[in-house]
């Protein structure tokens, strides 16, 4: 059997196989050692007994999407049946005091591979016995502690495979310079040691994406905005836009990145090299926000002027260029890429990313201030608590709700939170009455809210002993 017979039905075209060469990966036309690594079809009854105590689940994730030329990292995590875990030696053990369907186990081990390897590898001083090999016959690399690695992971994509020895979690990084743009499929098959052979325990697949567009995301933050995720913001208060570029492999670390903003409110274009920008909308309505990100990224070099034709064709750089083209394969000249020649073959190419959002601007509470605090005299001679009136003004829209959070003087330990609807006139002047149990210094956070906004003000207040002569003070 060959690798492609074992590892999946996705058969890339000859063009894809030729032009998606992954560094360090091998062709899936290679032979698979079925004796050491048995192959089971889906639904084969043997899967049921491939692992003691249940099925192992493999979870495959990636940091896709990847900008072409950058590295994409795949991670596989094995999830064992309940009460099982991998110990420091790579053995699979039962968790202490954990009860599964079978009850508590007397044997601490699910799989004691340390004992197995000591038994089976004694025949050869090098430890390189015929079974310590991958499915294609390549020997296991002898990293320190490699004997504690009891799982064999076979990654398969684009007609190529990569083999890795590991523990219950592995990571593999692939450079995407030669990968065709668009969605691609990664398949992983996991085997475990079983005496002098291996047993399949899990298969998993996931789609990843390679793109020539810089993956861009914009977070928006505005003071007093009640819900930052609804793309509704307040008039007359600055919105902070922060551009996040998805670049987990730091491919663009040394690139100059330009940000070109159009806020959709006829304020023109704003160009910046800073990933954050503030903008204030002064009118209500719906606006179309557009951002274009431009980065000079490492890229393929344009082919040099053609030399005298050799007798035998050699692969040209055109094949490398193809990998950047999201259209169907064509000659290099079809590729509308901006290329700039830089000495010693480190060429750069301008990559672009786009972000568009429709944002709604509405009236909101812009500001809130406590302008006066008054101790309310009670009819009882020595009341247990103090009633305090906070006279509050606000600017902007009419609040519908007031909340007070009363806490300790550090403003960290909340003692009491009270929210209630308020009726406020157009002048936006209101009095909030709150009870304070006992004298002392309190931190008072007072927020006024409406449907779209939440404005906060804070003060420290010193509540005196209930001696009528002692006045109420703002502690700050």
């Amino acid at each position: 059997k060959r690798f492609h017979d074992v590892l999946g039905n996705e058969r890339p075209s000859a063009y894809m196989r030729e032009h998606n060469q992954l560094n360090g990966w091998s062709s899936d036309e290679n032979d698979w050692n079925e004796k050491l690594y048995p192959v089971w079809k889906r639904g084969d009854m043997r899967w049921k007994n491939s692992w003691k105590g249940g099925r192992v689940q493999a979870v495959l994730t990636s940091d896709s999407p990847a900008l072409v030329g950058s590295n994409i990292t795949f991670a596989v995590n094995l999830i064992f049946p309940r009460c099982q875990k991998e110990d420091a030696n790579g053995n699979i053990v039962y968790e202490k005091n954990c009860r599964n369907e079978a009850g508590l186990s007397a044997d601490p081990y699910v799989y004691n591979w340390t004992a197995w390897s000591e038994d089976s590898d004694g025949e050869n001083g090098t430890g390189q016995s015929h079974h310590n090999v991958f499915p294609d016959g390549k020997p296991f690399p002898h990293h320190p502690g490699w004997r504690r690695w009891n799982f064999i992971y076979v990654f398969h994509t684009l007609g190529q495979y990569f083999q890795k020895l590991g523990r219950c979690s592995v990571r593999v990084s692939v450079n995407t310079a030669n990968v065709t743009l668009g969605p691609q499929l990664m398949e992983v098959t996991v085997y475990r040691r079983h005496g002098r052979a291996y047993v399949p325990i899990a298969q998993v697949k996931d789609v990843y994406v390679v793109t020539d567009q810089i993956p861009v995301f914009v977070t928006m933050f505005q003071k007093n905005d009640r819900n930052s995720s609804d793309e509704t913001f307040l008039k007359d208060l600055p919105i902070m836009f922060d551009v996040l570029i998805h670049d987990p492999s730091h491919f663009l670390n040394y690139s100059t990145i330009n940000y070109k903003w159009s806020f959709g409110d006829n304020t023109g274009l704003f160009v910046s090299t800073n990933h954050t920008v503030n903008h204030t909308y002064v009118l209500n309505g719906t606006f179309s926000l557009n951002l274009t990100v431009k980065a000079a990224a490492p890229g393929p070099c344009p082919p040099p002027p053609p030399p005298p034709r050799p007798s035998k064709p050699t692969p040209s750089l055109a094949t490398t260029l193809k990998s950047y083209d999201s259209n169907t394969p064509g000659p290099a000249g079809d590729n509308p890429l901006e290329l700039s020649r830089i000495p010693d073959e480190n060429c750069q190419i301008n990559r672009y990313g786009h972000f568009q959002a429709t944002i709604t601007i509405v009236e909101g509470i812009l500001e809130v201030n406590i302008i006066q605090m008054t101790d309310v005299l009670m009819p009882v001679p020595w009341p247990e608590s103090s009633l305090i009136d906070f006279v509050v003004t606000c600017q902007g829209s009419i609040p519908t709700e007031v909340c007070t959070i009363i806490s300790d003087p550090t403003c960290e330990i909340t003692q009491n939170t009270v929210c209630s609807p308020v009726d406020v006139d157009e002048m936006c002047l209101l009095t909030v009455r709150r009870t304070f149990n006992g004298s002392g210094t309190y931190c008072v956070n007072l927020t006024l809210g409406d449907d779209t906004s939440l404005a906060l003000t804070s003060t420290l207040i010193s509540v005196p002993d209930r001696d009528p002569a002692s006045p109420l003070r703002m502690a700050n």
């Epitope: 209630s420 006139d425 157009e426 009455r433």
Partner: antibody, heavy 116, light 110 residues
Framework: EVQLLESGGGLVQPGGSLRLSCAAS????????MSWVRQAPGKGLEWVSS????????YYADSVKGRFTISRDNSKNTLYLQMNSLRAEDTAVYYC?????????WGQGTLVTVSS | QSVLTQPPSASGTPGQRVTISCSGS????????VSWYQQLPGTAPKLLIY???QRPSGVPDRFSGSKSGTSASLAISGLRSEDEADYYC???????????FGGGTKLTVL
């Protein structure tokens, strides 16, 4: 002069629906929160629901949550109460009132009778 | 069973001073304004006191409100026969997220 005029009350069978209206005049309706309060025959006052001036915030008594819906049309200066799945215990005079932290003006009420 | 507790009835003779109490908790009376409503027989309720002790214009100063801790009181001095009505206290309850009323006090002028 502030005026609140309720309408839409009447006799309805259990499980039935009714929509009450409250026409407001004499003040800038869109600047005020509005509420519904009811009073069963011979009983005390029971708050039913309140809505903010813009209609974005709504509160309901537990006894009507999921069955009643408060709404408003500021262009028509009208407050509504849509009552579904009515029960015998919803029988009451329904008052429309201005504001929600206190009720400073009240309508004359409309009687809703739920009976088979 | 009302969240705010009022005596079911109270009485007094003309000219006398009568007090009606209203008891609650820190989530309503303790931290929110109390209002008092008067309901004359066969009519809609009318606001008598708001913000614990404030009188709307047109309400005689014979009516006064006060609050201490989690209790509130309505005092009517110089009682008149036209004061015979049901009186309700009310406040927002921040725990229930609801406006709550007392059960009402029937005032009889003897």
């Amino acid at each position: 002069e502030v005026q609140l005029l309720e309408s839409g009350g009447g006799l309805v069978q259990p499980g039935g629906s009714l929509r009450l209206s409250c026409a407001a005049s004499g003040f800038t309706f869109s600047n005020y929160a509005m509420s519904w309060v009811r009073q069963a025959p011979g009983k005390g006052l029971e708050w039913v629901s309140s809505i903010s001036h813009s209609g974005g915030s709504k509160y309901y008594a537990d006894s009507v949550k999921g069955r009643f819906t408060i709404s408003r049309d500021n262009s028509k200066n009208t407050l509504y109460l849509q009552m579904n799945s009515l029960r015998a215990e919803d029988t009451a005079v329904y008052y429309c009132a201005r504001k929600w932290s206190t009720f400073d003006y009240w309508g004359q009420g409309t009687l809703v009778t739920v009976s088979s | 069973q009302s969240v705010l507790t009022q005596p079911p009835s109270a009485s007094g003779t003309p000219g006398q001073r009568v007090t009606i109490s209203c008891s609650g908790s820190s989530s309503n009376i303790g931290n929110n304004y109390v209002s008092w409503y008067q309901q004359l027989p066969g009519t809609a309720p009318k606001l008598l006191i708001y913000a614990d002790s404030q009188r709307p214009s047109g309400v005689p100063d014979r009516f006064s409100g006060s609050k201490s801790g989690t209790s509130a009181s309505l005092a009517i001095s110089g009682l008149r026969s036209e004061d015979e009505a049901d009186y309700y206290c009310g406040a927002w309850d921040s725990s229930l997220n609801a406006y709550v009323f007392g059960g009402g006090t029937k005032l009889t002028v003897l």
